[in-house]
């Protein structure tokens, strides 16, 4: 699922879309004097049998209230760079933030973008003159539209749509993990974990200082850059004297296994090499740091195992939410299964099944997840993100419902709300198995494929499969067509 | 105006060497990787070589493997393909390719030179 | 290595009719919501000329009845309407590991 162009060529600007309707950026209206009201999560559970009516009522009340609004309309993400120009991206220049303000909030959404890792000199060079973007803010645009999770729309965001938005681009290709500034012996700047430090510490400057929650957030390496870098976060939070901000977590498409590949190749560039091989090179050239707890676990040379989140995550002090696909497609392709709509082997469709009851274990223990069973690939900044569901419920529902369960106290309880819930983990074993999964185009004619289809597409044996699962079948194909 | 400019072809003998040159012009030479392509009479491109940016990488297609050298001089703005061991399946229009920085993609090509391997 | 199977070798396209072009990568060329795929046209005698880049992008001064879709390892080039000048060979290309690589061909020939 290829995601929207935010970039264009040599810095030019995408064509910027109309204006929406005129909504205001928040419902609450600003006091004159003093603190700024609070502005509380949407409960939903009240509304549930008629959320549409619910939520137009929402834009109603929005509409008439934008006139009090001082600030006009803007969906976009403002760039600044950082004052501190010694936190750099890999070639030297300054690295950044895309921020929005939401005075009325006192919740910031920090997210960390991703786009893999390079991990030698060779690669890191290629990465540079094809993919400078991730490497340089020479070129970066002033302004970013905020999707998915980062949108101001209640509609596709029903989460936290009011919140504080700050986008971090993934500028140091060290899965976030770096400190490590260029040199005369380093042609290459690694410094992902500081950039998150000193993005930290300007925004105290911009209003942070008076936020109630802070939810680092990430997708891909970005997902792997908030098990890395959440403890820390709160920590820098607590020595600068704002131990009262909750930092949380919310890493999604990072939680990847240290598995064995399909088929074995040589790690000579990011997507071919194995998990481990890739972050044991790679955290030696990053120089890179991983959380202190779990660095203790593991003798010198082993702190690799730290970005693996299922050894990361007992480690973590600050709640942290997990999504992951369970059958991701990054995870696939370091694993060498590559799907390009040739039917697959039984071997390889052995795997991909093995994979996900492995994810599915590692999940196991975590309180907080979301993970259903699809073939893809990131979701919280897809605009889709409202869609997909894990037993009736979608990803913003639980993450509300995980909001929720911190009202009591400041650990997130054990036991979820009653019609609550936000330990969703997919049971079904085939991806895509889960009919709200994002939709699958045939590769060849574009047209949808239903689960049926697809599976039958990637050389699915009905037959066998239902001998397996003891069935018809007739019966097996129905099941898979209603998606149970 | 961008502009590439190959030079440095001609006829060879099998064994023999050849140094082709790519002189660039109308843009920071420093910024860009650079590529070789090669093209067979009546047949389709083949990729042949990388040079980064730095000039600190090279990478080379199997087939040419430890027969070509390619470097280049950011100072002067040039692209250098040094060939050994010719053989007649080297016969071809060599371009040299300016390589977008945010794709990969070949923006810029030169005319080309042709290369002949010929007893 | 990613191999790039193109198709059809040649095809002949009536004026002013769609000409597609499909480009299959042997494993998928899309990282981080973009893909690695570019085309190319070729004419007798001149070097390769961008058309599209990252699957869909339209080169500048490319004019728009030249369309390029796709992701993952599945990528199209479409030309509609098809015009005399539209008479060449086409490629595709992949930029995402090295080596890059480029597809076989196609050649078009106006009816």
């Known amino acids: 699922s290829e995601g929207r162009k935010t970039w264009r060529r040599r810095g030019q600007q995408p064509p910027q879309p109309p204006p929406p309707p005129p909504l205001p950026q928040r419902a609450e209206v600003e006091p004159g004097a003093g603190q700024p009201v609070e502005s509380f999560p949407l409960d939903f559970t009240a509304v549930e049998g008629n959320m549409d009516s619910f939520m137009a009522q929402v834009k109603s009340l929005a509409q008439s209230l934008y006139p009090c609004s001082a600030q006009q309309l803007n969906e976009d993400l403002r760039l600044h760079l950082l004052l501190n120009t010694s936190v750099t991206c890999n070639d030297g220049s300054p690295a950044g933030y895309y921020l929005k303000e939401s005075k009325g909030s006192r919740r910031w959404l920090l997210f960390l973008e991703g786009g893999w890792y390079c991990f030698n000199r060779e690669n890191c060079d290629s990465r540079y003159d094809t993919m400078r973007r991730l490497m340089s803010s020479k070129d970066w645009p002033h302004t970013r539209t905020g999707t998915g999770i980062l949108s101001s729309q209640p509609e596709e965001n029903p989460h936290w749509w009011n919140a504080n938005m700050v986008f971090i681009p993934y500028c140091s290709s060290d899965v976030w993990s770096g400190a490590s500034p260029k040199s005369d012996k380093n042609e290459y700047a690694f410094m992902g974990s500081l950039i998150i430090q000193e993005v930290v510490r300007e925004l105290l400057g911009k209003g942070l200082s008076g936020a109630k929650v802070l939810l680092l957030a990430g997708s891909s390496a970005g997902g792997t850059g908030v098990l890395l870098n959440v403890d820390r976060v709160a920590e820098l939070l607590e020595e600068l004297g704002y131990p009262s901000i909750q930092v949380r977590g919310l890493a999604d498409s990072g939680w990847f296994l240290d598995n064995k590949q399909y088929r074995r190749s040589d790690c000579i560039d990011t997507i071919n090499c194995a998990p481990t091989d890739a972050i044991r090179r790679g955290i030696r050239y990053w120089s890179g740091m991983v959380p202190e707890r779990c660095q203790r676990q593991f003798k010198e040379g082993e702190e690799w195992n730290c970005f693996f989140g299922y050894k990361v995550y007992p480690t973590l002090r600050c709640p942290v939410f997990v999504v992951q696909w369970l059958f991701d497609e990054a995870q696939l392709t370091v694993d060498n299964v590559h799907l390009t709509g040739q039917p697959v082997q039984e071997g390889q469709w052995l795997y991909i099944q093995n994979l996900g009851r492995e994810l599915r274990g590692t999940l196991k223990d975590v309180q907080a997840s979301f993970a259903p069973a699809c073939l893809s690939h990131e979701i919280i900044i897809r605009s889709y993100w409202t869609d997909v569901q894990v037993k009736g419920t979608s990803l913003p529902r639980a993450l509300h419902c995980w909001d929720r369960s911190f009202h009591d106290s400041h650990k997130a309880s054990k036991t979820p709300m009653k019609g609550c819930p936000f330990h969703l983990v997919d049971s079904c074993p085939w991806p895509h198995c889960n009919p709200s999964c994002p939709t699958i185009r045939d590769q060849f004619t574009g047209q949808e494929m239903n689960v049926a289809q697809f599976l039958m597409h990637m050389g699915f044996d009905v037959q066998t499969v239902a001998q397996q699962q003891g069935m018809e079948p007739s019966k097996l194909l129905g099941m898979l067509s209603n998606g149970n | 105006d961008v502009q590439l400019l190959e030079s440095g072809g001609g006829l060879v003998q099998p064994g023999g060497s050849r140094k082709l040159s790519c002189a660039a012009s109308?843009?920071?030479?420093?910024?860009?990787?650079m590529h070789w392509v090669r093209q067979a009479p009546e047949k389709g491109l083949e990729w042949v070589a990388y040079s980064s940016s730095g000039g600190t990488t090279v990478y080379y297609a199997d087939t040419v493997k430890g027969r070509l050298t390619l470097s280049r001089d950011n100072s002067k703005n040039t692209l250098f393909l040094e060939m050994t061991s010719l053989r007649s399946e080297d016969t071809a229009m060599y371009y040299c390719?300016?390589?977008?920085?945010?794709?990969?993609?070949?923006?810029?090509w030169g005319q080309g030179t042709s290369l002949t391997v010929s007893s | 290595d990613i191999v790039l199977t193109q198709s059809p070798a040649s095809l002949a396209v009536s004026l002013g009719q769609r000409a597609t072009i499909s480009c299959r990568a042997s494993k998928s060329v899309s990282t981080s919501g973009y893909s690695y795929i570019h085309w190319y046209q070729q004419k007798p005698g001149q070097p390769p000329k961008l058309l599209i880049y990252l699957a869909s992008d339209l080169e500048s001064g490319v004019p728009a009845r030249f369309s390029g879709s796709g992701s993952g390892a599945a990528f199209t080039l479409n030309i509609h309407p098809v015009e005399e000048e539209d008479a060449a060979t086409y490629y595709c290309?992949?930029?995402?590991?090295?080596?890059?690589?480029f597809g076989s061909g196609t050649k078009l020939e106006i009816k």
């Open positions: 109308g843009f920071t030479f420093s910024d860009f990787g």
């Open positions: 390719a300016r390589a977008s920085y945010d794709g990969g993609y070949f923006d810029c």
């Open positions: 290309h992949h930029s995402r590991e090295l080596p890059f690589t």
